[in-house]
């Protein structure tokens, strides 16, 4: 368990031409608030899909009234952090959507009017317990600057908040097999033993001996997939054999989503999928027009000239979604070579290379011999992320530092005697044989099987093998 924290630093006009209209005016003062939606993994999901990791709304910011003639400044922000608690392990990779909302404070009948000013989306990798990560995202002419982090709630620790820490029972050291808990060195990692047989994939425990099921699984050991097909009703009787959902009122009962929105349950509450032109937690907000700039990433907005007509975003290549807020999965083209893992970071593709490879697309087979010297005249041979030395005569070992015995393999044939020599070995041949390894017989008539002995050498002389 833990908390994802989001700190908004600024929201205002981005750099470059085409500064956005101020969202507030002297006639219609307004204030901002933010909504964050988190989803696990790096999936390309629709903005309307459930915020499976959780969602949060900020407080309302200070009331802002535009000063006539002044350029739109950074707008006043709500105080405090947006906090999204997560009950299970932190997934490490996540998708986020941050929406900036405007609340108009004029004399509207029926209370304040809400409208969506900007929505940014992204996908990131983040380890729990790490430092604040800073980010800048642009939506149309607006720019949002923010920081985020994930932190574990005690007693959980670790990059996924799955390890538990307990105060030390003894002041000096932890019990057998238990490690100190970094960064809480005065605490020890606690052994957490779930109920015997609890599914490691679909179950977890926060207390020893229990087995709690992830969404979609049921049964005492979380081994039964939830299925409503065999139930008497969509929320029929609970049974470990049928895997039916537990009875009782659900968060979507009565459909809390307005304006034709469809409701889907989340682990904590519900999520409304709104028809085009409606937004908000319950699809209660309407009136987004092309003038509000709802299309991101250079999308072209058509229609939606007035709040009663829907707009359509025509997305540029590489983007999709009702607001062009999602990137196409470019990694499906598998641009990384040599088994590298592709990561689509939005602004660029990155490849995580296997050992032995490097480069932006893992295209370089690392020079295994770089910086590796083979001693005594040996030469380095590359291969498969490791290096090997091919040693000169008389030397051996991984780096050719060991002096080899060239006579160990008995290289002299026909009873020749072997002598080690600085440049290799020398064979002293037995009578009747000659050659570097005494491999050639001398014919009885004195003629050699070789065309002729080298000058200065007589048959039977030791031959030096070079």
């Amino acid at each position: 368990a833990g908390v994802f924290e989001l700190q908004i630093h600024s929201f205002g006009p981005g750099p470059g031409p085409g500064a956005p209209r101020s969202p507030c005016s002297a006639r219609l003062p307004c204030r901002l608030f933010f909504r964050v939606c988190l989803k696990p993994g790096l999936s390309e999901e629709a903005a309307e899909s459930p915020c499976a990791l959780g969602a949060a709304l900020s407080a309302r910011g200070p009331v802002y009234t535009e000063q006539p003639g002044a350029p739109a400044p950074d707008l006043p922000l709500p105080d405090g952090l947006l906090q999204v608690p997560f009950r299970d392990a932190w997934p490490g990779t996540f998708s986020f959507i941050i929406e900036t909302w405007r609340e108009e404070l004029g004399d509207q009948i029926g209370g304040p009017a809400w409208s969506l000013l900007a929505r940014v989306a992204g996908r990131r990798r983040l380890a729990a317990g790490g430092p604040w990560a800073r980010d800048i995202q642009r939506a149309g002419a607006w720019e949002l600057r923010f920081s985020y982090r994930a932190r574990c709630e005690p007693p959980a620790v670790g990059t996924a908040c799955t390890r538990l820490c307990r105060p030390r029972s003894a002041p000096s050291r932890c019990g057998p097999g238990l490690r100190p808990c970094a960064p809480l060195e005065d605490e020890c990692e606690a052994p957490l033993v779930c109920r015997a047989g609890c599914s490691p994939e679909h179950g977890f425990c926060e207390q020893p001996g229990e087995c709690r099921c992830l969404e979609g699984w049921t049964g005492p050991l979380c081994t039964v997939p939830v299925s409503t097909s065999s139930c008497l009703s969509p929320r029929g009787p609970s049974s470990a054999t049928t895997g039916c959902l537990v009875p009782g009122p659900g968060p979507c009962d009565g459909n809390p989503c307005a304006n034709g929105g469809s409701c889907s349950e989340t682990p904590r509450s519900f999520e409304c999928t709104c028809p085009r032109g409606f937004y908000g937690l319950r699809c209660e907000v309407s009136g987004v027009t092309c003038a509000d700039g709802p299309c991101f990433n250079g999308g072209l907005c058509v229609g939606g000239a007035d709040p009663d007509s829907a707009y359509i975003c025509h997305c540029p290549p590489g983007f999709q979604g009702s607001n062009c807020e999602k990137r196409v999965d470019r990694c499906s083209l598998q641009p990384c070579r040599n088994g590298g893992l592709c990561l689509d970071l939005g602004h660029a593709l990155r490849c995580r290379c296997r050992a032995g490879f490097a480069g932006p697309r893992c295209e370089h087979d690392l020079d295994d011999c770089a910086g590796r010297a083979c001693a005594n005249g040996g030469t380095c041979v590359e291969g498969g992320g490791a290096h090997r030395c091919s040693c000169a005569l008389g030397f051996g070992g991984r780096d050719c530092r060991e002096r080899a015995d060239p006579c160990a393999a008995r290289p002299c044939a026909h009873g020749g005697r072997c002598y080690a020599h600085f440049s290799g070995l020398v064979c002293a041949c037995a009578p009747g044989y000659m050659g570097a390894r005494c491999e050639f017989p001398v014919h009885p008539d004195g003629a050699s099987a070789l065309p002729a002995a080298p000058p200065g050498l007589r048959p039977g002389d030791p031959q030096r093998y070079l």
Epitope: G318, R330, L333, Q334, P335, C336, R337, N338, G340, L349, P360, R361, C362, E363
Partner: nanobody, 120 residues
Framework: EVQLVESGGGEVQPGGSLRLSCAAS????????MGWYRQAPGKQRELVAG???????KYAESVKGRFTISRDNAKNTVYLQMSSLRAEDTAVYYC??????????????WGQGTLVTVKP
Amino acid sequence: EVQLVESGGGEVQPGGSLRLSCAASGSIFSINAMGWYRQAPGKQRELVAGFTGDTSTKYAESVKGRFTISRDNAKNTVYLQMSSLRAEDTAVYYCAADVQLLNSDYEFYWGQGTLVTVKP
């Protein structure tokens, strides 16, 4: 800057064939990966066929045996031969390329798309 220009789209009857072409031009040092995506109305864009970074070919399950991707390295061009076309193949087909530029950076580029309509 790199441009991807697609051609060959059009209207065809079920069972018919079309051949799409995509030519890459600009400050290209090499083409690392190149292929075809498609997007039907209201659907996600999906990879249809491509040459991966390791130069192997990759096909979506739904087009295996019907579509064939080929390339002309000298012309920096890829082709998609589509046969036995079905109504569900109707979509805008986009060319995509992961390109190593002359400055050695890698960038991912998209074409503007060409419409393929399959109807009786």
